[in-house]
């Protein structure tokens, strides 16, 4: 392309660079639905924001294709553990794409935090962090799931969260 | 703005892009003060560096406003656990801003690692990682706190650290 | 440099910016060699990719010098723990450089997950995540090691992985 075209592309890139897609969504009282769906998130209040990404029913929705570092942390805790709970808690980031009917696992962790109660207390806390780079197309969505979500502890948006930025 | 202005901005952006703010600070013998203050960090030796950010008394200080991925890991460990310590260890990243008198929680984890000793050995190890994107204004500071900091294990700067980069 | 030179540099930067180095490698059946070497990774199938970085025998190889956010997660698990296993599992990212004969520790975690089995089950799961910014020169390599690697659980590339991107 000629110099004018290159110039336009550079200007374009500068502007788009100013809004390199990024988001950080935070846990809220409404995050845990108990419906078997993904966790829901706060998108505006406090530390939460969306920049060049959108949100729909728990999902970060990609508007610009590319490689994204996606991450999530969940705060787990309890007083003992519910009976019948498998000794595994699964925390994962999953992709929804129009090209495939089922969610695809992207990044997943399994933990057994219920064995972490101290001798002095049946109370236990644990935290699970996931982060990694994935390619996402425009229109694709990423969600967070935790099984068993009853063990997710929400407070003020600082302990359980979900985010992404283009790399 | 005219082409000359645009050109200048592009040149400027190229230069600033070369120094996209980033930092990685490492744990050192002096990190744990026992004073109730934040952890202190090595800023120059070994793997530690500052690029487009500054440091003051444990804090990463922002010089250029924007969205930053901030992160910290702390290595926890002990031989048994002190009583009087709640069964929770809290590891957090906190913001100090001239516009507000108190530190603001950004990213926080709670863990109960003391219940993790094996049957006969009282030795336990655990690690806590935090990372997420937050908006920071020029002059704002981010610090790391761990309660109870007696359980933080320092060695060579690879196990406990604190960093950030602009996204 | 004159305007033509600046223009060339900008064009160059735009093109290189398009391929900001990034990679995400995933765990596979062949990852655990039992040979005492680093973990091996899938580089092409599924979620795995290399962009502006190369791969050799478990190592991410840097082609363009700069600051990189490097990360790794490993899924740990077992039914009890092997006898004689120290109560510590070490998960680390290490640098190989032509300028030094030994690997250098970059980011390391120690954990005692074997104490995490619940009272009703000897099964335990745990996850270790590492991430941080390091400076890497062209030709330098980064590898992942886990001691004892017998406790690493592989499945589908979502639970144990290794990646990097330039910041």
């Amino acid at each position: 392309d000629g110099p004018a075209g290159s110039w336009e592309q550079l200007i374009q890139e500068r502007r788009s660079h100013e809004v390199n897609p990024a988001a950080h969504l935070t846990g809220a009282n409404s995050s845990l639905t108990g419906s078997g769906g993904p966790l829901l998130w706060e998108t505006q209040l406090g530390l939460a924001f969306l920049r060049g990404l959108s949100y729909h029913d728990g999902a970060l929705v990609v508007t610009k294709a590319g490689y994204y570092y996606i991450y999530s942390k969940v705060q787990l805790g309890g007083v003992g553990c519910p009976l019948g709970l498998a000794s595994t808690i699964t925390h994962g980031l999953y992709k929804r794409t129009p090209r495939y009917p089922e969610e695809l696992e992207l990044l997943v962790s399994q933990q057994s935090p219920c064995g972490r109660a101290t001798s002095s207390s049946r109370v236990w806390w644990d935290s699970s962090f996931l982060g990694g780079v994935v390619h996402l197309e425009a229109g694709e969505e990423v969600v967070v799931r935790v099984l068993d979500e009853r063990l997710v502890r929400l407070r003020d948006g600082t302990r359980s969260y979900f985010g992404a930025f283009m790399v | 703005d005219g082409p000359a202005g645009s050109w200048e901005q592009l040149i400027q952006e190229r230069r600033s892009h070369e120094v996209n703010p980033a930092a990685h600070l490492t744990g050192a013998n002096s990190s744990l003060t026992g004073s109730g203050g934040p952890l202190l960090w090595e800023t120059q030796l070994g793997l530690a560096f500052l690029r487009g950010l500054s440091y003051h008394d444990g804090a990463l200080v922002v010089t250029k406003a924007g969205y930053y991925y901030i992160y910290s890991k702390v290595q926890l460990g002990g031989v048994g656990c002190p009583l009087g310590l709640a069964s929770t260890i809290t590891h957090g990243l906190y913001k100090r801003t001239p516009r507000y008198p108190e530190e603001l929680e950004l990213l926080v984890s709670q863990q109960s690692p003391c219940g993790r000793a094996t049957s006969s050995s009282r030795v336990w190890w655990d690690s806590s990682f935090l990372g997420g994107v937050v908006h920071l204004e020029a002059g704002e500071e981010v610090v790391v706190r761990v309660l109870d900091e007696r359980l933080v294990r320092l060695r060579d700067g690879t196990r406990s650290y604190f960093g950030a980069f602009m996204v | 440099d004159g305007p033509a030179g600046s223009w060339e540099q900008l064009i160059q930067e735009r093109r290189s910016h398009e391929v900001n180095p990034a990679a995400h490698l995933t765990g596979a059946n062949s990852s655990l060699t039992g040979s005492g070497g680093p973990l091996l990774w899938e580089t092409q199938l599924g979620l795995a990719f290399l962009r502006g970085l190369s791969y050799h025998d478990g190592a991410l190889v840097v082609t363009k010098a700069g600051y990189y956010y490097i990360y790794s997660k490993v899924q740990l698990g077992g039914v009890g723990c092997p006898l004689g296993l120290a109560s510590t599992i070490t998960h680390g990212l290490y640098k190989r450089t032509p300028r030094y004969p030994e690997e250098l520790e970059l980011l390391v975690s120690q954990q005692s997950p074997c104490g995490r089995a619940t009272s009703s089950s000897r099964v335990w799961w745990d996850s270790s995540f590492l991430g941080g910014v390091v400076h890497l020169e062209a030709g330098e390599e980064v590898v992942v090691r886990v001691l004892d690697e017998r406790l690493v659980r592989l499945r589908d590339g979502t639970r144990s992985y290794f990646g990097a991107f330039m910041v």
């Epitope: 001798s119 002095s120 207390s121 | 460990g77 002990g78 031989v79 048994g80 656990c81 002190p82 009583l83 009087g84 049957s119 006969s120 050995s121 009282r122 030795v123 007696r150 294990r153 060695r155 | -």
Partner: antibody, heavy 120, light 111 residues
Framework: EVKLEESGAELVKPGASVRLSCKTS????????VYWVKQRPGQGLEWIGE????????NFNEKFKSKATLTVDKSSSTAYMHLSSLTSEDSAVYYC?????????????WGQGTSVTVSS | DIVMTQSPASLAVSLGQRATISCKAS??????????MNWYQQKPGQPPKLLIY???HLDSGIPARFSASGSGTDFTLNIHPVEEEDAATYYC?????????FGSGTKLEIK
Amino acid sequence: EVKLEESGAELVKPGASVRLSCKTSGYTFTNYYVYWVKQRPGQGLEWIGEINPTNGDPNFNEKFKSKATLTVDKSSSTAYMHLSSLTSEDSAVYYCTRSNWDYGNAMDFWGQGTSVTVSS
Amino acid sequence: DIVMTQSPASLAVSLGQRATISCKASQSVDFDGDGYMNWYQQKPGQPPKLLIYKASHLDSGIPARFSASGSGTDFTLNIHPVEEEDAATYYCQQSIEDPFTFGSGTKLEIK
């Protein structure tokens, strides 16, 4: 001033049981484990076990599991050890001690000891 | 259980001289750079008294003539210069693994 005051000497018959007390003062009772240690006449020291005063959770040396019961009364900052089915092997001085985590779980304060003699 | 082997069983040292007591653990008692080894002094009719914690740290109120060192499995208690009041039995003890175990004791006599 940190103090651990133990109950007086006991003379008991074989097969009987005894309860020893350890009243603490001068520190926050719930902030330190209480350990119990046995010393037979002219012999060395044996760690019996510990109790967490916060919730009364005990942890024993396997050797003493069926012999000793450890309890606490938080209201009086007192720890107790109950020894059952006594035999001559149980004749010893029993010490309660405070464990200091900051000192690497060392026993930094000791009671004066309670002498238990098992004899018919 | 970790076995603590203390030597000698007894020793006689002249006033003002050095007394050295050794303690060997059947496995390492180190954690993160610290040895979880403690030393106690016991005089007849009295409870033991803590002298040294975490291999080399002097408890408060203990005179500086007491010192200790070691790591891993091998630890040493030194008293120099020995004084009359140091006549006692000395015990080492590990505090890293259940059950906590003591050495068999070293009886120090002052000549």
